[in-house]
């Protein structure tokens, strides 16, 4: 397991919300990518492949998430204080072997700017 | 401990069908992509057919498309192969097996833990 | 699809002694997509070595897998009384497929 800090933006803010971006190399095929808050599982993706290229999803713990082709974000939204944290991408590389779990992370701090809804 | 029991085999004549059933149990089963996998006693291995964790994706040997239908039930822990239109050439022990890493695929997996397996016979 | 053949066909040692097998891919097995498998009579294979190098869980260390592209070889280092098996290669991209085997048997 290699362990380190994401050398680049993780987090990007918006509206209230935060977007965690989890990067894989372009070259994997199948993996599991899993978005720890400490250590506690928030979010969880699969992709796999069949014959023919056929792609298939699943989310274990679901949250609102987006894939491309070296990437998965996660989103959190309303913000409170609680969210701040270490966040780390847990990623489960199936295909191409060897099988290889890495894990990147990074500090989100919450700033009054950032909070969802913030009192007047 | 993880266990895969294969049942459903058995003597047919050729042309006949038979229901092959794969029970798994201490393993969180649709975490895993499943195959089959059989073996002429005495001979090497082939692999027949595979599913995904949910059976939206399925493939198998060309030996056997066409007339083995791959499927599965997560609720109940199962993994099943319908064989129709069975030949002699089909008789062999039947395997079923995971795929190794807990991934959900078939494809491009190999596997690790396999059942003792159940024997098919195609005669006259 | 990629055909596999492994040699040889059997192999005569005693125990203690290093053992090498080999399988050779009619074309190039991408991405080291190669497993070795062992079984012995009446159970079913045992995965050994995945990605042609990786050793599977609880796999001792005296097995080895090494090889790229077309040609392949599974090592035993010293050959324990319970290695004495059937050995099967297999490419698993796409459509899984085995070699006819490799027995290992006492001299």
């Known amino acids: 397991e290699i362990n380190g800090s994401a050398n680049y933006e993780m987090f990007i803010f918006h509206n209230g919300g935060v977007q965690i971006l989890c990067k894989y190399p372009d070259i994997v095929q199948q993996f599991k990518m899993q978005l720890l808050k400490g250590g506690q599982i928030l979010c969880d993706l699969t992709k796999t492949k069949g014959s023919g290229n056929t792609v298939s999803i699943k989310s274990l713990k679901f949250c609102h998430s987006q894939l491309s082709n070296n990437s998965v974000s996660f989103f959190l939204y309303n913000l409170d204080r609680s969210h701040a944290n270490y966040y780390f991408c847990n990623l489960s590389i199936f295909d191409p072997p060897p099988f290889k779990v890495t894990l990147t992370g990074g500090y989100l701090h919450i700033y009054e700017s950032q909070l969802c809804c913030q009192l007047k | 401990e993880v266990q895969l029991v294969e049942s459903g085999g058995g003597v047919v004549r050729p042309g006949g069908s038979l229901r092959l059933s794969c029970a798994a149990s201490g393993l969180t089963f649709d975490d895993y992509g499943m195959s089959w996998v059989r073996q002429v006693p005495g001979k090497g291995l082939e692999w027949v057919s595979g599913i995904n964790w949910n059976g939206d994706n399925t493939d198998y040997a060309d030996s056997v498309k066409g007339r083995f239908t791959i499927s599965r039930d997560n609720a109940k822990n199962s993994l099943y192969l319908q064989m129709n239109s069975l030949r002699a050439e089909d008789t062999a022990l039947y395997y079923c097996?995971?795929?190794?890493?807990?991934?959900?695929?078939?494809?491009?997996?190999?596997?690790?833990?396999w059942g003792q397996g159940t024997l098919v016979t195609v005669s006259s | 699809e990629i055909v596999l053949t492994q040699s040889p066909g059997t192999l005569s040692l005693s125990p203690g002694e290093r053992a090498t097998l080999s399988c050779r891919a009619s074309q190039s097995v991408s991405s080291s997509y190669l497993a070795w498998y062992q079984q012995k009579p009446g159970q079913a294979p045992r995965l050994l070595i995945y990605g042609a190098s990786s050793r599977a869980t609880g796999i001792p260390d005296r097995f080895s897998g090494s090889g790229s592209g077309t040609d392949f070889t599974l090592t035993i280092r010293r050959l324990e009384p319970e290695d004495f098996a059937v050995y099967y290669c297999q490419q698993y991209g796409s459509s899984p497929f085995f070699g006819p085997g490799t027995k290992v048997d006492i001299k």
């Open positions: 097996a995971r795929d190794y890493y807990g991934s959900g695929s078939y494809y491009n997996v190999p596997f690790d833990y």
